[in-house]
Amino acid sequence: DSSKWVFEHPETLYAWEGACVWIPCTYRALDGDLESFILFHNPEYNKNTSKFDGTRLYESTKDGKVPSEQKRVQFLGDKNKNCTLSIHPVHLNDSGQLGLRMESKTEKWMERIHLNVSERPFPPHIQLPPEIQESQEVTLTCLLNFSCYGYPIQLQWLLEGVPMRQAAVTSTSLTIKSVFTRSELKFSPQWSHHGKIVTCQLQDADGKFLSNDTVQLNVKHTPKLEIKVTPSDAIVREGDSVTMTCEVSSSNPEYTTVSWLKDGTSLKKQNTFTLNLREVTKDQSGKYCCQVSNDVGPGRSEEVFLQVQYAPEPSTVQILHSPAVEGSQVEFLCMSLANPLPTNYTWYHNGKEMQGRTEEKVHIPKILPWHAGTYSCVAENILGTGQRGPGAELDVQYPPKKVTTVIQNPMPIREGDTVTLSCNYNSSNPSVTRYEWKPHGAWEEPSLGVLKIQNVGWDNTTIACAACNSWCSWASPVALNVQYAPRDVRVRKIKPLSEIHSGNSVSLQCDFSSSHPKEVQFFWEKNGRLLGKESQLNFDSISPEDAGSYSCWVNNSIGQTASKAWTLEVLYAPRRLRVSMSPGDQVMEGKSATLTCESDANPPVSHYTWFDWNNQSLPYHSQKLRLEPVKVQHSGAYWCQGTNSVGKGRSPLSTLTVYYSPETIGRR
């Protein structure tokens, strides 16, 4: 209530002989500042004197004098709120009640604080959680109801007398609420810590032992087991017996059930600490362990790997990759269950042993068509040799092999024949699905791989075919060797280089562009008459009579070909000139007489000249000389001369007789 002074401090303080005590303390006086303070030891109120009796440990008066024996006790407070005290050193007989007698101007107060000083340092107190489980982190607390600035202490944790590695966190409190030193240790106990002694040791600043507290750890844990196997290496052969024993090395609380597991699965009707396996089979190979449970949970032993050894089982072959393309690489894997693992392998291809291939894997770096077939293997270990399994099939795909173009016709092939070709191949995988032909033509393919060329041309030289599956393989081109009659036969003048004049030496050549077969015969013909059988027709001295239409023929075994008719033209000067007279060589005067200069010339006569019997040229230059009317004096011998580009020719004399008419005769 409002008539009380208000104090705050720990109710009791603890210390031991020789240590010190620090008393945190606050107050609030009813009025004014503190004027007098006396610290009593076990004060008692004297009703007679209305004062407190007891040992005065400390006294502060208005004059501020402090007796010399009071140096041990210090008032660290002030005049209005702090009443902290320190006793250093503290003695056993300081135990009891401390009385703080406070006086202000008008008010007085006695505040009591309990001091518990023991003869020796008192032990700290270890606090444990209600339950400790293995591997679960817990905090261990060591609490000591003591702290004093003038007397440093430390708390150390020990496990079975050995300092603990974990770092502890130490805290101190010197407050009006509490005075203590506390050490907290975070710790994950293992099952092996069960029953172990944990100590919290109080030490002075120099590490000297002062006191301690100990607790025995009660670590709850699943059963800890040991498994023993006979034989100890757990390697047996089919038909042998195996015994496994499960031993509980620790359990807290006590175990309740036992079971056995193989490869993680519980074995039925196996609930004792011994597992007997009689006449084991390879299926019983595996990882065995025993499981024992308590209230915390199940505990499992380490696994024992039981190996039941047996000879390899029939093997199977795995192929990477089938189908394989020629030239690619392929890997074969021999798979055979065996224990121990096979040490040697024998490989077979189509039942024949593959030399030098003794590994689990066979790698063929470059596959060939003949590698196709069945691959099998046999595995071998120390217990025996397995059986050869069914094997695996390798399919090797490759382009068509040995492709050939074959001419089906009887030979030789003649121009105009119908030719049939077939495209043949030796082998192919996958099957041939189509064919290609070179060169391309408007030819028919009556069936797959067959080509029909109707009316084969003389110039159809070579044909090649390709057989195609996923790839095309081309055959070497085959020569059709088409036989044909000589082609492009023509007459060619070799000499002379210019026009042919009568008397020249003349050579004509019978040319052709090609012939198959090459062996040929020649024939020269003029007006249906055979002239020669050489490739050339020669005239030592050509005469106009040789002019005309010439043909040459070239013959081979297939047929004969004629050239176009070739006209041989011989140039010559006018010849065989003669003068013809019309109506005759005797003409009656007064009538008309026509003299014609007839000639044979090539080119034709371009210019005529007429001469009389006196070799006088007449002023006439055409082929015909017309005399009209004809006179008697015109009688006489006449001749003509013809001229062309080659030369001149003259006629013999022709006589014209002009006789008198009856009238003239009558007049005479």
Epitope: G327, W347, M354, G356, R357, K366
Partner: antibody, heavy 122, light 107 residues
């Protein structure tokens, strides 16, 4: 009867390119599974494989020498040619060509040439 | 590449002795190991192929064994003509490699 015969220069100058020819008879390098290799042997030292060419013309080289080697074949002449660039005195050796079979992979060098000694010196 | 190690590098033995030469591979090569004999100034000659297969024309005193990484060439009763250098060779993978050789002398 299968025979192989090596030919080439007996003396090569440093930095020059060596060309060796292996002429064989009794085998055809167009036959599937036929391979020809070059192997060398420095005086008093071990055999060292250099290169291989197979029936397809595919070639393979020694890892340490592959930048300097070229192997080729002329099936019409029944010849395999090896060229080795940047010759050095350490390349002085007897050079052999050998036939290698190929069944389910590479077999052994079953037939060897008589070898040709090549000296590299300036 | 696969490294082949031969032991011993050389040996001397008496006529009629049993001689064994070892070849070890740096990784498993199955049985793809072959043995060659090379006499002075001659080309190598194939003795044993695929680790243990004898060749026609090779005397029966020569035999081979082993697989995986460890191989042995045995000369059952040494003869004077067996003085030579013996090489092992692997054809398991490219690049092909030879052992450093074992020189056999007659005492």
């Amino acid at each position: 009867q299968v025979t192989l015969r090596e030919s080439g220069p007996a003396l090569v100058k440093p930095t020059q390119t060596l060309t060796l020819t292996c002429t064989f008879s009794g085998i055809s390098l167009t036959t599937s599974g036929m391979c020809v290799s070059w192997i060398r042997q420095p005086p008093g030292k071990a055999l060292e494989w250099l290169a291989l060419i197979d029936w397809d013309g595919d070639n393979y080289y020694s890892t340490s020498l592959k930048t300097r080697l070229t192997i080729s074949k002329d099936t019409s002449k029944n010849q395999v040619v090896l060229t080795m660039a940047s010759m050095d005195p350490v390349d002085t050796a007897t050079y052999y060509c050998a036939r290698m079979g190929y069944t389910y992979g590479y077999d052994a060098f079953d037939i060897w040439g008589q070898g040709t000694m090549v000296t590299v010196s300036s | 590449e696969i490294v082949l190690t031969q032991t011993p590098s050389s040996l001397s033995a008496s006529l009629g002795d049993r001689v064994t030469i070892s070849c070890r591979a740096s990784q498993s090569i199955g049985s793809l190991l072959h043995w060659y004999q090379q006499k002075p100034d001659q080309s190598p000659k194939l003795l044993i192929k695929f680790a243990s297969q004898s060749l026609s024309g090779v005397p029966s005193r020569f035999s081979g064994s082993g697989s995986g990484t460890d191989f042995t060439l045995t000369i059952n009763s040494l003869e004077a003509e067996d003085a030579a250098t013996y090489y092992c060779h692997q054809s398991r993978s490219l690049p092909f490699t030879f052992g450093p050789g074992t020189k056999v002398d007659i005492n």
